[in-house]
Amino acid sequence: DGHGGSWEQLIQERRSHQNNPAAHLTGANSSLTGSGGPLLWETQLGLAFLRGLDYHDGALVANKAGYYYIYSKVQLGGVGCPLGLASTITHGLYKRTPRYPEELELLVSQQSPCGRATSNSRVWWDSSFLGGVVHLEVGEEVVVRVLDERLVRLRDGTRSYFGAFMV
Amino acid sequence: DGHGGSWEQLIQERRSHQNNPAAHLTGANSSLTGSGGPLLWETQLGLAFLRGLDYHDGALVANKAGYYYIYSKVQLGGVGCPLGLASTITHGLYKRTPRYPEELELLVSQQSPCGRATSNSRVWWDSSFLGGVVHLEVGEEVVVRVLDERLVRLRDGTRSYFGAFMV
Amino acid sequence: DGHGGSWEQLIQERRSHQNNPAAHLTGANSSLTGSGGPLLWETQLGLAFLRGLDYHDGALVANKAGYYYIYSKVQLGGVGCPLGLASTITHGLYKRTPRYPEELELLVSQQSPCGRATSNSRVWWDSSFLGGVVHLEVGEEVVVRVLDERLVRLRDGTRSYFGAFMV
């Protein structure tokens, strides 16, 4: 009967999922730094939360090793495009690990949204969604990058976001 | 040894995931009401199911508090567009809660798909996918809205859908 | 006290998710066969892995019955389009089951990406993401198909991929 405490805890864990790492971070005015770094995110206000994951300078940080479904959406838009109709946007999720000096590409999309904007109507909107399962060791980080960052439209945290949960 | 029943149940739960709330709802002819309300969904036929979540007038309703990965895809398409290249489509997931009188935006995308129709062939297709983790209390509801609903193409439940599962 | 082994195993399972089926397969040079069959995938190298799911000729195969969140992303791109600017791309996830002779559509998207290529710059990029919850019995398979396959761009496994996990 020495299992008592663990037993109750296990039932509680199973029922509530309370210990399953999960996070949803939202876009904010400070997300776009223009510094060449990753996007930064809101972690507490509104819809944003961290449960069993940490946050550091734009990165979600694993506290527990395992497989995670990671995802990000970015809202793109503009009036015309910086490079004209040939503009390509790259939206990606990247891993930082102490075991390797450079960021590792995990999930990446390329889009050419500006072909939609013409001389008559140069306003356009587009969206990019990425999601997939990756393995993270304790302390490994995942960040979001968008090139060209100038085309990301932020508003209220619902249109551009970044999250993860253990599977 | 009073743990017996619960113990077996717990093993069964863990192994089968049978009690983890999940749902996948599919588009149907009745999905588009033209009334300004949310999209309606098929809950039983074909690929559609509800497990530990309820459905009411287009909404997935939480029976258990927690964090849920919610998602929706809508198939967009048309022959030309009502507002030409300026036509914008907004696809969103929204929360209804007794604690607040208005729907709360959770995950939203804006797209300008009509630039995909070329000079002669006015036919175009586009797709919008949303997914992210949100917290739901018991009784809170999530709905899908698309503006302009006229541009949603329904067929067989595989192209437009709405789902969730607890994480 | 006859529960000892199972008890420890259960705690271990709960804590590590080690027995929850999951997979992430990545695009490779051999993915596009041109044979009219499904896309083929890398299962071991780089980011690819299988945990509690099998792989066979492009298909993820369920070893355990239940509901799975299945997903795929394909990177599309080209210089112009094979059928001119009206080209439509269909990206889908399909189920193969011994109980039915034909593949069953699960999740499907249609896109007209070539409208993004203009007369000045005929290079275009687009991306298609699908994800949703479906039920799989033991031995049932899920495959990815893209029509027109010629428009899928492979590089390093980060832009086109296919995965699943039990929910």
């Epitope: 008559n120 109507s121 | 022959v79 009502p82 290249l85 300026a86 006015r122 | -």
Partner: antibody
């Protein structure tokens, strides 16, 4: 009620230009496409093109490129069509037709403007 | 351009009988289960009036004696029972591709 009021009959000389107007009322002007259609005596209907009042974007029938030019004045809910370099092929009745809610048909029409070209 | 061929060019139908007008497109005007085919009525000195949109949908305010059918390339307008006021020229029109094109018209005379 929806009404499209077109300008009165026009007479012009060969080589000249003429501006036809179509004033909309009874609905939200920017929410509907406006099309222009030509009807020559004893012949069928010909679609000239369309304008999207919300943006001013235009699409023309290749046959009328360089012949017709559309514009919009949102403040007065009016669309215009300029026909230039008039020839003997241009005399006709010109109609504006509003794009329907599902935008690929014309559900309301102006009464038409008769254009005569005479030297 | 998509060519719309209407037949017959003219027809005379007795009051109360059925008038059938055919329209053939040079290529399919279907998209995702919908047919982008419309029918208009035009009387002398008047603008055209929309009768049927998307091949078979009756425009608001149009009498139920008008009906449309067909898909792909072959379409039909039926009027039954024909009334005196139906004397007019009828046009089919496709809107799947630019330029929109009309059939040559069918002149209906009531006997």
């Amino acid at each position: 009620q929806v009404q499209l009021q077109q300008s009165g009959a026009e007479m012009a000389s060969p080589g000249a230009s003429v501006t036809l107007s179509c004033k909309a009322s009874g609905y939200t002007f920017i929410d509907h496409i406006m099309n222009w259609v030509k009807k020559r005596p004893g012949q069928g209907l010909e679609w000239i093109g369309r304008i999207y009042p919300v943006s001013g974007e235009t699409n023309y029938n290749q046959k009328f490129m360089g012949k017709a030019t559309f514009s919009v004045d949102r403040s007065s809910s009016t669309v215009y069509m300029v026909l230039n370099s008039l020839t003997s092929e241009d005399p006709a009745v010109y109609y504006c037709g509003r794009g329907s809610y599902y935008w690929n048909a014309m559900d309301y029409w102006g009464q038409g403007t008769t254009l005569t070209v005479s030297s | 351009d998509i060519v719309m061929t209407q037949s017959p060019a003219s027809l005379a139908v007795s009051l109360g009988q059925r008038a059938t007008i055919s329209c053939k497109a040079s290529q399919s005007v279907d998209f995702d289960g919908d047919s982008y085919m419309n029918w208009y009525q035009q009387k002398p000195g008047q603008p055209p009036k929309l009768l049927i949109y998307s091949a078979s949908n009756l425009e608001s305010g149009i009498p139920a004696r008008f009906s449309g059918s067909g898909s792909g390339t072959d379409f039909t307008l039926n009027i039954h029972p024909v009334e005196e006021e139906d004397a007019a020229t009828y046009y089919c029109q496709q809107s799947i591709e630019d330029p929109w094109t009309f059939g040559g018209g069918t002149k209906l005379e009531i006997k």
